[in-house]
């Protein structure tokens, strides 16, 4: 109708001005639209400059919406990580505090003279939990070797024990089992418990990091055009009241977020593996009962050594020869009473159960995050039409949207009518993050089986990192061993951890 050809652009002026743009750009009345590059070229209230400004704005608004959704998920994962991390660290710190409080009374100089060895063990356990690249079994073996050497000297102050004799003692140790069953039990249980705890917390870190990195992936130019058409072309074409058709919006965002949707399978695998590994938090080899009770195994070990002292000495002499006696030294150390300590099994505090049930629920809630993202953004951010199908904005006019809704992921966008997607060019950042998810899932599966995987990263660039910054100080390049000088590749998923305590030692 010829009269409508010179419709006023008042509504567009209002919306455009509200966006912070200069009103001098807006024509008073509709103009011919041959200059439009994105919107349909009918009569329009938008100049080229306005179209460009609104295209940039719509692009920025979608990126903001995407980042907001990601931030909510990141915050949830970060809160979970902090809660579990605090709990696990608390268990270990509690055990160390108990040891420091009870061992001097229970074992006297057998403890105080070796406080450094015990402190080092807890430091190593803490570092291992936080993602340091050390071998837990080796660390424990070296602790026992070191402790045996020192305690044997203490229990036999009358003997001259040169380094070569102590070397021999060390070689005999495995057969002699001087500490009874405690080292073996601790090794089996601690390996399972620490592997489970650290891989679970690392999983949370990796998940959070993937979300953060993916949120930074820029939307391409084809997406920008499609989003402009979706959000602002209705204004330019004089139907500002028309809201986007739901299926139209979904197709645009499925095209824009095609690469992100490809995270879905590995994301689900990761979250499933994390939920699964929480099974390992319970029972006698569970995280709570083991990490919180390290000191009780240590007490059992010292008691066993004292009980076995005479047999042990006889066997050592048999294997290593008769050591010289220090004429000025005293007789053998008096047998101390057995160190009495609280029973090994810690009653569960209930904290971990609560943390796990919350985590399971929240992880289940976000399992379909990546494939539900287009729908979520459309319904929450795009002010979709609730009107009947033929009253919504379909990208060309007010009316029905006929094309079918595309499937999820890059491959399914081959015929997306709204966004031209090159399915042969997947986004490399997202491919790397898929790889990070795979690696972490494999770690969790190994951890579920009680295995401490060799933390070698197969990532393309090693860019994935559990806490966002890679390793804490230089934890990851270290490989502790008094005997060997082998080293492993750095671990790229470290944990946020406590600052290392630097107290004055009391020996």
């Amino acid at each position: 109708d010829p009269a409508s050809k010179s419709r006023s652009c008042g509504e567009v002026r209002q919306i455009y001005g509200a966006k912070g743009f200069s009103l001098s750009d807006v024509p008073q009345a509709e103009i011919s639209g041959e200059h439009l590059r994105i919107c349909p070229q009918g009569y329009t209230c938008c100049t080229s400059e306005m179209e460009e400004n609104l295209a940039n704005r719509s692009h920025a608004e979608l990126e903001t919406a995407l980042r907001d959704s990601s931030r909510v998920l990141q915050a949830m994962l970060a809160t979970q990580l902090r809660s579990f991390d605090d709990h696990f660290q608390h268990l270990l710190n509690d055990s160390e505090r108990t040891l420091q409080a009870t061992f001097p009374g229970a074992f006297g100089e057998l403890y105080t003279q070796n406080a450094r060895a015990f402190r080092d063990l807890y430091s190593e356990l803490r570092l291992y939990y936080r993602g340091a690249n050390l071998h837990l079994e080796e660390t424990l073996a070296e602790f026992w070797a070191r402790l045996l050497e020192r305690l044997f000297k203490q229990l036999h102050p009358q003997l001259l024990l040169p380094d070569d004799y102590l070397d021999c003692l060390g070689k005999q140790a495995e057969a002699l089992r001087p500490f009874g069953e405690a080292p073996r039990e601790l090794r089996l249980r601690a390996t399972r418990a620490f592997v489970a705890a650290r891989s679970f917390v690392q999983g949370l870190g990796v998940a959070s990091d993937v979300v953060r990195k993916v949120a930074q992936v820029p939307l391409g130019p084809e997406c920008s055009r499609a989003v402009m058409k979706l959000v602002y072309c209705a204004h330019c074409l004089g139907v500002p009241g028309a809201r986007p058709c739901p299926d139209y919006c979904r197709n645009v965002l499925k095209g824009c977020l095609a690469n992100q949707a490809d995270l879905d399978a590995e994301w689900r695998n990761l979250l499933d593996s994390m939920v699964l590994i929480t099974d390992k938090f319970w029972g006698t080899s569970g995280v709570e009962s083991v990490i919180g009770s390290v000191h009780t195994w240590l007490a059992e070990a010292i008691n066993a050594l004292q009980d076995n002292r005479d047999t042990l000495t006889a066997k050592v002499i048999q294997g290593c020869g008769n050591p010289k006696v220090n004429p000025q030294g005293p007789g053998p150390e008096e047998k101390r009473r057995r160190g009495k300590l609280a029973p090994r099994e810690r009653p569960p505090s209930g904290t971990l159960e609560k943390l796990v049930s919350e985590a399971k629920a929240q992880l289940r809630d976000v399992q379909d995050f990546w494939i539900s993202l287009p729908g979520t953004l459309c319904s929450e951010k795009m002010a979709l039409s609730t009107a009947s199908d033929d009253r919504c904005w379909n990208g060309m006019a007010r009316g029905r949207y006929l094309p079918e809704v595309m499937g999820d992921g890059l491959a399914n966008q081959i015929n997306n009518p709204e966004v031209e997607v090159d399915i042969t060019k997947p986004d490399m950042t997202i491919r790397q993050q898929i790889m990070q998810l795979k690696i972490m899932t494999n770690r969790l599966r190994s951890a579920y089986n009680g295995n401490d995987v060799d933390f070698q990263d197969a990532s393309d660039d090693g860019s994935g990192s559990g806490s966002g910054d890679g390793c804490l100080d230089d934890l990851c390049s270290r490989k502790v061993s008094r005997k060997s000088s082998s080293s492993r590749t750095p671990l790229t998923h470290a944990l946020p951890g406590l600052s290392e305590q630097e107290g004055q030692k009391t020996s």
Epitope: R150, L160, V480, S484, S485, E500, Q504, K505
Partner: antibody, heavy 119, light 107 residues
Framework: QVQLVQSGAEVKKPGASVKVSCKAS????????MHWVRQAPGQGLEWMGE????????TYNQKFKARVTMTRDTSTSTVYMELSSLRSEDTAVYYC????????????WGQGTLVTVSS | VIWMTQSPSSVSASVGDRVTITCRAS??????LAWYQQKPGKAPRILIY???TLQTGAPSRFSGSGFGTDFTLTISSVQPEDFATYYC?????????FGGGTKVEIK
């Protein structure tokens, strides 16, 4: 063979800080504690503290606790000792020394670094 | 703090002499004691650990004895290269402490 190579001599003004390095080779760096011992001209030996290169844990002599910081870099097998708020009585040769085994006894020593504090 | 007291602070000897240096701890340190030799401009060198065990590579004319609080370093027959300063050190508790040193001089 085990070698500890320290950084060169330093001249500092009172109130300044000095950071001495000690690069280790010939053994597993993370397997043995490293200590710092100083010796003022014509005087005896004074223990300053130790660092566990494996964990970074440190223990300092109370006398230096407020002024000394020991750190390590496992990638270069190097330990560092930083002493702040220097005064003239800190003029000394500073040695790094590696424990023999887990026994607080020093089997290997660096060549020493002379730090002179003078206005 | 465990204080280590060495005596004498210096001793003059001729080549071939027997020299004895003593070290006393302010409290019992069992056998946690080491002896070092230091020559001018050089770093100390370990001779004895665990009070009486000779370090590999140290000459057999050096010997250590003692337990608890009283310790002795003996050079059975002083050689020209033995003229140096000797320090004892306790390794039982922090802070680790050294004796004040004993200078063995040529008579």
């Amino acid at each position: 063979q085990v070698q500890l190579v320290q950084s060169g001599a330093e001249v500092k003004k009172p109130g300044a800080s000095v950071k001495v390095s000690c690069k280790a080779s010939g053994y597993t760096f993370t397997g043995y504690y490293m200590h710092w011992v100083r010796q003022a001209p014509g005087q005896g030996l004074e223990w300053m503290g130790e660092i566990n290169p494996s964990t970074g844990d440190t223990t300092y002599n109370q006398k230096f606790k407020a002024r000394v910081t020991m750190t390590r870099d496992t990638s270069t097998s190097t330990v560092y000792m930083e002493l702040s708020s220097l005064r003239s009585e800190d003029t000394a040769v500073y040695y790094c020394a590696r424990e023999k085994r887990d026994d607080g006894v020093f089997a290997y020593w660096g060549q020493g670094t002379l730090v002179t504090v003078s206005s | 703090v465990i204080w280590m007291t060495q005596s004498p602070s210096s001793v003059s000897a001729s080549v071939g002499d027997r020299v004895t240096i003593t070290c006393r701890a302010s409290q019992a340190i069992n056998g946690w004691l080491a002896w070092y030799q230091q020559k001018p401009g050089k770093a100390p060198r370990i001779l004895i650990y665990s009070a009486s065990t000779l370090q590999t590579g140290a000459p057999s004319r050096f010997s250590g004895s003692g337990f608890g609080t009283d310790f002795t370093l003996t050079i059975s027959s002083v050689q020209p290269e033995d003229f140096a300063t000797y320090y004892c050190q306790q390794a039982k508790s922090y802070p680790l402490t050294f004796g004040g040193g004993t200078k063995v001089e040529i008579k």
